[in-house]
Interface confidence: low
């Protein structure tokens, strides 16, 4: 079986080899990386190019997002005939080179992950000395960040009619399934899931009256673990205490 | 031209563990990743995870976790994977591929092993 | 993870005859992959990023399709097309199959 494109099966991993004439631009990537929260992902990129022997100035580049226009996440620049590649940026000390551009190669290690991080990943190499010329990854690699639930909010609000209402919302991925209970709600009452616009990993849910005083607690739940936090509810004189 | 050499049919008892390997030759085994499959009658194809032996990096489908490992050895163009406490839903034909991860999202398994037949039985 | 459904699980055609078969995904993808298994072999890729054909493959076979739902069409069917046909997703983790069509040739 052949492919209809070039296969480049030259070593990528020896400088010593000479590339085919017919060698061209192109990068490996995987589709998604998956890791969980707290932990370090690396993200692939192997590449190879149409220039012989380049030795001169180079630059790796990877970006989030958006190819082409999405911000840089890492940087680093290589001098002439030199392998060490100096990091002129790493957002928030956390992105690191694992690969060695001049061996093609521009692998990247991402510590300390957060959900944050889960978005597309682009990586990039420019050439700059007697051969100008860059490529970057059209499709990049998906990195998938999941992550056991963690309550980020629990309240008591007032509602009209002298009512209350209690909201829970928590992050986590998959995104956690939420559940009250409480008072007169029974061993537990499931809510409805709503992830809020823009917020993927954020699921809120509401209980729309509170009819007794007492602990009320919401639980998230997802395959990675559970989270539970509480919220009191004392009406005295028409005031309502609420504590976590 | 590009080969990829699986090893032999293996019989098996429950609760214990096998390993099989996976040869390359004709390409530079460093510059692609391995994938393995899974294929049960009436159950299709399963993918089981891939390896890129030049970065030792593994992607593994979380259903096969704590199931399948894999590894690859640079010194001799050999992937493997091993599956351990076998039960009878392990019993399969298992393939491995190359998988070519090209530029423009065109992702594919574009050569296949013979595959490697494993019967768990007591 | 991305469910794949083919249908029909199993096709009978003459030789001649334009054959269809589709797949759909329980989830929107950007690419369908086709591949062709006779038995006792290994699967072969035959179509990649939905349209394309791979080396070898004969310009009878068509494949297309978006979103959820992609088809491999032959528009003559010849006595060697007999195989199963499984369609695959690499858009997220983990990477799924379809059950298969099973193609036979009256």
């Known amino acids: 079986f052949v492919r209809t494109k070039i296969d480049t099966t030259e070593n990528l991993l020896n400088t010593e080899v000479h590339s085919s004439p017919a060698q061209r631009w192109s990068m490996q990537v995987p589709p998604e990386v998956s890791a969980e929260a707290g932990d370090a992902a690396v993200l692939p990129c192997t590449f190879t190019h149409p220039h012989r022997h380049y030795d001169g100035p180079l630059t790796a580049i990877w970006r989030a997002g958006e190819p082409y226009a999405g911000p840089q996440v890492f940087r680093c620049a290589a001098a002439r005939g030199s392998e060490l590649c100096q990091t002129a940026l790493s957002l928030h000390g956390r992105f690191r080179l694992l690969g060695n551009p001049r061996r093609n190669d521009l692998s990247l290690r991402v510590e300390r992950l957060a959900l944050a991080d889960d978005r597309r990943y682009f990586c990039r190499v420019e050439f700059a000395g007697d051969v100008h010329d860059r490529y970057e990854s059209r499709h990049g690699v998906r990195l998938h960040v999941t992550a056991a639930p963690r309550i980020v909010n629990i309240s008591v609000l007032p509602s009209p009619a002298h009512a209350f209402r209690a909201l829970c919302t928590a992050e986590g991925e998959p995104p956690p399934a939420l559940a009250w209970s409480g008072p007169a709600l029974g061993n537990s009452l499931a809510a409805v899931r709503s992830p809020r616009e823009g917020h993927g990993h954020l699921v809120t849910a509401e209980l729309p009256a509170l009819t007794h005083d007492g602990r009320y607690t919401c639980t998230a739940a997802n395959s990675l673990g559970r989270s539970e936090a509480s919220v009191y509810l004392f009406r005295f004189h028409g005031a309502s205490g609420a504590s976590t | 031209q590009v080969q990829l050499q699986q090893s032999g049919a293996e019989l098996v008892r429950p609760g214990t563990s096998v390993q099989m390997s996976c040869k390359a030759a004709?390409?530079?085994?460093?510059?692609?990743?391995i994938g393995w499959v899974k294929q049960r009658p009436g159950h299709g194809l399963e993918w089981v995870g891939d390896?890129?032996?030049?970065?030792?990096?593994?992607n593994n489908n979380e259903k096969f976790r704590g199931k399948a490992t894999l590894t690859a050895d640079t010194s001799s163009n050999t992937a493997y994977m091993q599956l351990r406490g076998l039960t009878s839903d392990d019993s399969a034909i298992y393939y491995c591929?190359?998988?070519?991860?090209?530029?423009?999202?065109?992702?594919?398994?574009?050569?296949w092993g013979q595959g490697t037949s494993v019967t768990v039985s007591s | 993870q991305i469910v794949l459904s083919q249908s029909p699980a199993l096709l009978s055609a003459s030789p001649g005859e334009k054959v269809t078969m589709t797949c759909r995904a329980s989830?929107?993808?950007?690419?369908m992959y086709w591949y062709q298994q006779k038995p006792g072999s290994s699967p072969k890729p035959w179509i990649y990023a939905t349209s394309n054909l791979t080396s070898g493959v004969p310009a009878r076979f068509s494949g297309s399709g978006s979103g959820t739902s992609y088809s491999l069409t032959i528009s003559r069917v010849e006595a060697e097309d007999a195989a199963t046909y499984f369609c695959q997703q690499w858009n997220s983790k983990p990477w799924t199959f379809g059950g298969g069509s099973k193609l036979e040739i009256r």
């Open positions: 390896i890129h032996p030049g970065i030792n990096y593994t």
């Open positions: 591929a190359r998988v070519d991860y090209d530029y423009d999202g065109s992702y594919i398994m574009d050569y």
């Open positions: 004709g390409y530079t085994f460093t510059n692609y990743w």
């Open positions: 989830s929107s993808v950007s690419y």
